[in-house]
Each structure stands twice: as structure tokens, then as C-alpha cells.
Interface confidence: low
């Protein structure tokens, strides 16, 4: 009304999007009767009647608020449900009696933005760019009003800085009336920023106060020139022949340069390029002593064509050469002596051991094994082991067979075998000697011979048990250039029902099996009674 004092500031009502705003008409009784009130919304200085109160009863006016308004608090309060950003305006109530007075309410609407989404520039940033490059983009969706964005690097806020840091923010209004904020951080980065953590923070207000949301932290691919290349060898420590060794080039630039690995030819002193795998790694598998030498890496920047050379690295593949034993195939008479000498080369100090092959017993620690007053039992295998004590697993061995001249000797002289008539027996006989003997049997049957080692032979015989065979027994004879020797197998009848399972009269490596004549093509292990004390 003209001439009246300036209107007081409207009452502030703050509410979140989607909730209900309670608009309380603040007219005093002297200013008007609350049972007769008109409610208006004011938008761009234009008043629109939205609700009438008559005799305490409310009635919505047709329009955008028709479905969302209701009276509360005995008519003093107008409730507006499902508040939207478009509802941010002034509402006023006007009392009609005793005279027209109005009360204004400023409705403020808030909506927290969604979690900020940060996207790093996937192409990366070169350190030598002339002006700030796009580092990352931060998007905060569906907030109201527009949130404020702050960028952080390593936990510290970034400020606009001429030619160094530029923050470019823009917003769009969604159909819902909510704002989507997009902020682009542009910066000039340095090499040290390769590990820097960037994130953005959205600051926004709600009726409850000020709030903020942080994005995840991101790192940006930073491209910077290589200043140094070097070689790395895996595994670290002492290498040995047979290991899988990987030699790789490393560089302090990003992206790394194109690598090539060269080995110095020890004869020509020239670097010869080695063939690397698809990852630029030189894999030596298995590593050999020839792989030892001086390696270096060349890094070629394909953009600038600048080439950098690493410090050379000396690679030592430790080895033990083939072990040589002399004499290589010793032959001696009984009663004589023998000195076995073991030799090998290595990149490290060697330790030698002599072992008896058959038993694994250590006979000597050192390269020379002396055997005196040789008996025939001394014949057989001796193994020299050349090892590098400082490198576990680095060893080579050589087996030498000592042959003692002599007539054959048998694994057993005589044996009793329990049999049943008409069974097929599987008999075996073993003999040793030098020269290696051959074995013959005194009965007809199917015999086969196997060389067990240079001095030892095993013969097996399949034979049908007949009355004649029970009478004569079975003899095996071993012979060589120096003599002959015989083993006798006595066959004794037994009733199968009296046999005890798993009893065994076999001595040495001899075995006997029996099966019914009706199954002459198959054999099964014979069950034998215990051998008598006396061997007869």
C-alpha cells in the first residue's frame, strides 16, 4: 500500500527436494482473521492465487499447486508436498479482515548432488606442454542449488594460477530443475606429478547446514622424457646354469623408450643385439655359461630419436662343466689297487665327493678316490659329484663303472622252491662278473636275459613243473671267459591249501612264481613255505 513502511524481509523456509514445506502464515490476530486467507505464489513479481481459506476450510485453486497443497495446524499452516526446485519462490498469505494484510515466506529448496564422478584424461599429459592441459573432469549430477567445486592435489586445494592451473566449470539444468555441474581441471604438470593424487570436492548446502562430497582419487598419466636407462636381472644373486634368467631394460621416462639389449662379443668386443620377447625381456632359459658376459641396454625415444645407453652389467652364469673321471672305464684284477680322479671346471670353487652308486654311501670328500686290495664286491658304480657349495643345486656328476676281472658269482648258490605239479614256474637267476657272464639253464623252457649293469645279468625262465623236473631240480649256469658258476633250485611239492600267503624263500633278486598248467600263458606270484634252516 503506497505510503506504508517498507515490507519486512520474508520469513525463510528451507526444505529438501521431495519433502514437504510447511508455510506458516505469520499474520497476527490484529492483522487479519486466519479463517479468511488467500495464499499466493510470487514468480517474477507476478502473484498467482493458489489457495483460499474460508471459515477455516481450504480450497486449492486450479494450476500447478492444485494437487500438492493442504491446510495444517488449524488453518495457520499451508503444507506443500513433493517440493521441486521450481518451488523456490516467495509465497504470501493475505488476510482479508479487518483489513488486507500480507505475510511473505521465502521458500528455499536444496538437493544434495550425487557422488562426484571424476574421469582422468586417458591420453595423459606431457610435462613440456606450453599451456595447461586437461587433467581430469569432475561431474556432480542433480544438485540444487549449483554446488561449488574445489580441486585437490595430494590433499591440498588447487587455486587458479595463471599459465599453471585453470579450472573451467559449467552447469546444465536438467528437466527436473536440478543442476549438473561439470568442472574441468587444466594444469601444467611436472614429472613429480606422476604419482600425484587428484580429486574433486563438491560443496553444497542443505537445511541442516553445509556439506561436501569427495570423488575418488585418481592419478594422471604423465609423460616425461627418459633421462636414464638401466638393466635389471632376475633372479638377483648368484645365477647358475639351468636357471631361468630374465634381463630387462628399465627407464625413468614415460612412456618408456624402445629397448634393445646387446651383449658384448668377448672376441670382437662388439655389442651384438640379443633377441628379446614381445615384452622386450631377454629370457635365458635355460641359462648357460655362454650367456655370461657384458650386457647393455639401449633406449630409443621414437619421438625424438634420442638414444640412451645403460651402464653395462656383467652377467655371470655360474656353471660346473661336464665331470671327467679317469680312468673312464677301469678294469682291474682282484687284489689290485685303483685310483679314481675326478676333474671339472667351474666359475666358482668346487667341492668333490665320491659315492658308492648302489648304496649312496659317501666314500671320500675330495677329487681323488683310492681303492686298495680290490675284491670282486668292489666292482660296480662309483659316482663323482662336483658341486659349488655357495650355490645350492649347482652340481654335475659322473658315474664310473669299476670292473673287477673274475669268474661269475651268483646271487645265491642254492634255494628251495615249493611247487605244485602241473604249474608253470617263473624262476630267476642272477650273476655278476667281468667280462659280463651269460646264463644258461639245464631244462627246456622260455628263458630271457636282461643286462642289469655292465657286470650283472638277470635271466628268467618259465617252465612247467613235471615229475622229472621235481626229480632233477633246476640249475642255472653263468659263464664268462674266466670260468663258470652254478646255482641250484630244489623243487619240493606242496599242497596249496597249506601255503601261507606272502611267505618268501627268495634270496637276492631271485623270484619264483607258479600257476596252474591250465593257465600256462599267465603267471601269478607263488606262495612259498618258509625255507628250512639247512639249505641242503
Amino acid at each position: 500500500v503506497p505510503g506504508e513502511a517498507e515490507q519486512p524481509a520474508p520469513e525463510l523456509v528451507e526444505v529438501e527436494v521431495g519433502s514437504t514445506a510447511l508455510l506458516k502464515c505469520g499474520l497476527s490476530q490484529s492483522q487479519g482473521n486466519l479463517s479468511h486467507v488467500d495464499w499466493f505464489s510470487v514468480h517474477k513479481e507476478k502473484r498467482t492465487l493458489i489457495f483460499r481459506v474460508r471459515q477455516g476450510q481450504g480450497q486449492s485453486e486450479p494450476g500447478e499447486y492444485e494437487q500438492r497443497l493442504s491446510l495444517q495446524d488449524r488453518g495457520a499452516t499451508l503444507a506443500l508436498t513433493q517440493v521441486t526446485p521450481q518451488d523456490e519462490r516467495i509465497f504470501l498469505c493475505q488476510g482479508k479482515r479487518p483489513r488486507s494484510q500480507e505475510y511473505r515466506i521465502q521458500l528455499r529448496v536444496y538437493k544434495a548432488p550425487e557422488e562426484p564422478n571424476i574421469q582422468v584424461n586417458p591420453l595423459g599429459i606431457p610435462v613440456n606442454s606450453k599451456e595447461p592441459e586437461e587433467v581430469a573432469t569432475c561431474v556432480g549430477r542433480n544438485g540444487y542449488p549449483i554446488p561449488q567445486v574445489i580441486w585437490y592435489k595430494n590433499g591440498r586445494p588447487l587455486k587458479e594460477e595463471k599459465n599453471r592451473v585453470h579450472i573451467q566449470s559449467s552447469q546444465t539444468v536438467e528437466s527436473s530443475g536440478l543442476y549438473t555441474l561439470q568442472s574441468i581441471l587444466k594444469a601444467q604438470l611436472v614429472k613429480e606429478d606422476k604419482d600425484a593424487q587428484f580429486y574433486c570436492e563438491l560443496n553444497y548446502r542443505l537445511p541442516s547446514g553445509n556439506h561436501m562430497k569427495e570423488s575418488r582419487e585418481v592419478t594422471v598419466p604423465v609423460f616425461y622424457p627418459t633421462e636414464k636407462v638401466w638393466l635389471e636381472v632376475e633372479p638377483v644373486g648368484m645365477l647358475k646354469e639351468g636357471d631361468r634368467v630374465e634381463i630387462r631394460c628399465l627407464a625413468d621416462g614415460n612412456p618408456p623408450p624402445h629397448f634393445s639389449i646387446s651383449k658384448q662379443n668377448p672376441s670382437t668386443r662388439e655389442a651384438e643385439e640379443e633377441t628379446t620377447n614381445d615384452n622386450g625381456v631377454l629370457v635365458l632359459e635355460p641359462a648357460r655359461k655362454e650367456h655370461s658376459g657384458r650386457y647393455e641396454c639401449q633406449g630409443l625415444d621414437l619421438d625424438t630419436m634420442i638414444s640412451l645407453l645403460s651402464e653395462p652389467q656383467e652377467l655371470l652364469v655360474n656353471y660346473v662343466s661336464d665331470v671327467r673321471v679317469s680312468p673312464a672305464a677301469p678294469e682291474r684284477q682282484e687284489g689290485s689297487s685303483l685310483t679314481l680322479t675326478c676333474e671339472a671346471e667351474s666359475s666358482q670353487d668346487l667341492e668333490f665327493q665320491w659315492l658308492r652308486e648302489e648304496t649312496g654311501q659317501v666314500l671320500e670328500r675330495g677329487p681323488v678316490l683310492q681303492l686298495h686290495d680290490l675284491k670282486r664286491e668292489a666292482g660296480g658304480g662309483y659316482r663323482c659329484v662336483a658341486s659349488v657349495p655357495s650355490i645350492p643345486g649347482l652340481n654335475r656328476t659322473q658315474l664310473v663303472n669299476v670292473a673287477i676281472f673274475g669268474p661269475p658269482w651268483m646271487a645265491f648258490k642254492e634255494r628251495k622252491v615249493w611247487v605244485k605239479e602241473n604249474m608253470v614256474l617263473n624262476l630267476s637267476c642272477e650273476a655278476s662278473g667281468h667280462p659280463r657272464p651269460t646264463i644258461s639253464w639245464n631244462v627246456n623252457g622260455t628263458a630271457s636275459e636282461q643286462d642289469q649293469d655292465p657286470q650283472r645279468v638277470l635271466s628268467t625262465l618259465n617252465v612247467l613243473v613235471t615229475p622229472e623236473l621235481l626229480e632233477t631240480g633246476v640249475e642255472c649256469t653263468a659263464s664268462n671267459d674266466l670260468g663258470k658258476n652254478t646255482s641250484i633250485l630244489f623243487l619240493e611239492l606242496v599242497n596249496l591249501t597249506t601255503l601261507t600267503p606272502d611267505s618268501n624263500t627268495t634270496t637276492g633278486l631271485s623270484t619264483s612264481t607258479a600257476s596252474p598248467h591250465t593257465r600256462a600263458n599267465s603267471t601269478s606270484t607263488e606262495r612259498k613255505l618258509p625255507e628250512p634252516e639247512s639249505r641242503g
Epitope: 670382437t268 668386443r269 662388439e270 651384438e272 643385439e273 655359461k289 655362454e290
Partner: antibody, heavy 121, light 107 residues
Framework: EVQLLQSGGGLVQPGGSLRLSCAAS????????MSWVRQAPGKGLEWVSA????????YYTDSVKGRFTISRDNSKNTLYLQMNSLRAEDTAVYYC??????????????WGQGTLVTVSS | ILTQDPAVSVALGQTVRITCQGD??????ASWYQQKPGQAPVLVIY???NRPSGIPDRFSGSSSGTTASLTITGAQAEDEADYYC????????????FGGGTKLTVL
């Protein structure tokens, strides 16, 4: 395209001398070791001599040591074999050969056309 | 120092293996060369089992102990030639050595 063009062969009397040349093109000559390989008529290949890319190291098979000298002129991209005190058994086709990129572990990937040396009175 | 069979024959389209023996092959792979009459040798296999460009994939190499092998799978008439193995000397010097060569006849 790699090319090795040989010259200098011919007939020479026992005790005489001859110099073989091998002009290289199509690759960085000074980066590669080079060798001479010979083949007597109807016989197999026999490695004779090698020289490092810089020319600083030379190697010979026993039968030619002290009589043959391998050399190279990297400014002219040319390999040489100076043969003195020639013998009848030196009669052969002589080939120059370029070592593989990987070095002589991988053998010789390019060969000259060969030049015949005949030692006869 | 490198030993090869003097001659080997193979029926057209069949597989043939040419072997090379020598102490140096424990430490080094053999290179293999093909030589046709009146021509310079041609490298066909180098290293573990690598073919230079232009060499058909019917050629392959392998090695076990002191023996190296060149295998031609599905031999063609044009494969008839002399084949030489080649290696560094086993003495650890920079010397090289060739095998005596194997004459391959394709029947």
C-alpha cells in the same frame, strides 16, 4: 638390398700371392663381422677367416695362419683377403659372408657370388 | 668336428631329417645352409629354430645333446641340394666350423 660383390680371383702359381675383395652395400658394413669361406672343387664348405666389424679382431683356421690376412676398409665398405705363399690345396671358390644380425651364433645370412682361386704351376 | 651323413634321399612329398653331430652343439645351436650346384650357400635355419624371410616353413631345426637336426617336411624337387651345418667351435675360441655336408636327393 644387401649385396656382396667379389673380385680378385684367378690363376696363380704355388708360392704366389693374390688379394680378394668383397664390396658390400645395403647394410651398415661397420656393424657386422665378416668371414671368408672357401669350397674346394667337389668338396664341402670350409671356414677360413673372420674379422670383427671394427677390424680390431681377426681369426683364422689353422691351415692358413701366417699366410692369409683378413682386413676391411669401412670407409669403402670393402672386405679383403690377402693370400700369400699359396699352395695347391688353397685352390677353391672363395666366398665372403656377412654375419647374421644376431652375430655369428646365427651364422651367415648373406654370401658373395664366389670367386675361383686356382693355384697351379 | 661336426659330422654329417654324406648322402640322404627322400621321396617327393615325404619328410627327411638331416643330422649333425659335434661337441660344440651342446653349447651352440647349429646354423643350416642349402647349396645348389654353382650357387652360393643360402642360410635356411639359424638359432634354436628360426627361418630367414623367404625360407619355406617346411624347413625346421631342432637340437638334442650333441646332435642338431634339419627336418624338411614334405620335400619338394627344388630342395635337392647340399646341406651344411655350421657352428662355433667347442673350444670357446671365436673359430667357426662347418659339417662335411649332406647331399639330399629328392626321388
Amino acid at each position: 638390398e644387401v649385396q656382396l660383390l667379389q673380385s680378385g680371383g684367378g690363376l696363380v702359381q704355388p708360392g704366389g700371392s693374390l688379394r680378394l675383395s668383397c664390396a658390400a652395400s645395403g647394410f651398415t658394413f661397420s656393424s657386422y663381422a665378416m668371414s671368408w669361406v672357401r669350397q674346394a672343387p667337389g668338396k664341402g664348405l670350409e671356414w677360413v677367416s673372420a674379422i670383427s666389424g671394427s677390424g680390431g679382431s681377426t681369426y683364422y683356421t689353422d691351415s692358413v695362419k701366417g699366410r692369409f690376412t683378413i682386413s676391411r676398409d669401412n670407409s669403402k665398405n670393402t672386405l679383403y683377403l690377402q693370400m700369400n705363399s699359396l699352395r695347391a690345396e688353397d685352390t677353391a671358390v672363395y666366398y665372403c659372408a656377412k654375419s647374421h644380425d644376431y652375430g655369428d651364433y646365427a651364422g651367415f645370412d648373406y654370401w658373395g657370388q664366389g670367386t675361383l682361386v686356382t693355384v697351379s704351376s | 668336428i661336426l659330422t654329417q651323413d654324406p648322402a640322404v634321399s627322400v621321396a617327393l612329398g615325404q619328410t627327411v631329417r638331416i643330422t649333425c653331430q659335434g661337441d660344440s652343439l651342446k653349447s651352440y645351436y647349429a646354423s643350416w645352409y642349402q647349396q645348389k650346384p654353382g650357387q652360393a650357400p643360402v642360410l635356411v635355419i639359424y638359432g634354436k629354430n628360426n627361418r630367414p624371410s623367404g625360407i619355406p616353413d617346411r624347413f625346421s631345426g631342432s637340437s638334442s645333446g650333441t646332435t642338431a637336426s634339419l627336418t624338411i617336411t614334405g620335400a619338394q624337387a627344388e630342395d635337392e641340394a647340399d646341406y651344411y651345418c655350421h657352428s662355433r667351435d667347442s673350444s670357446g675360441t671365436h673359430l667357426r666350423v662347418f659339417g662335411g655336408g649332406t647331399k639330399l636327393t629328392v626321388l
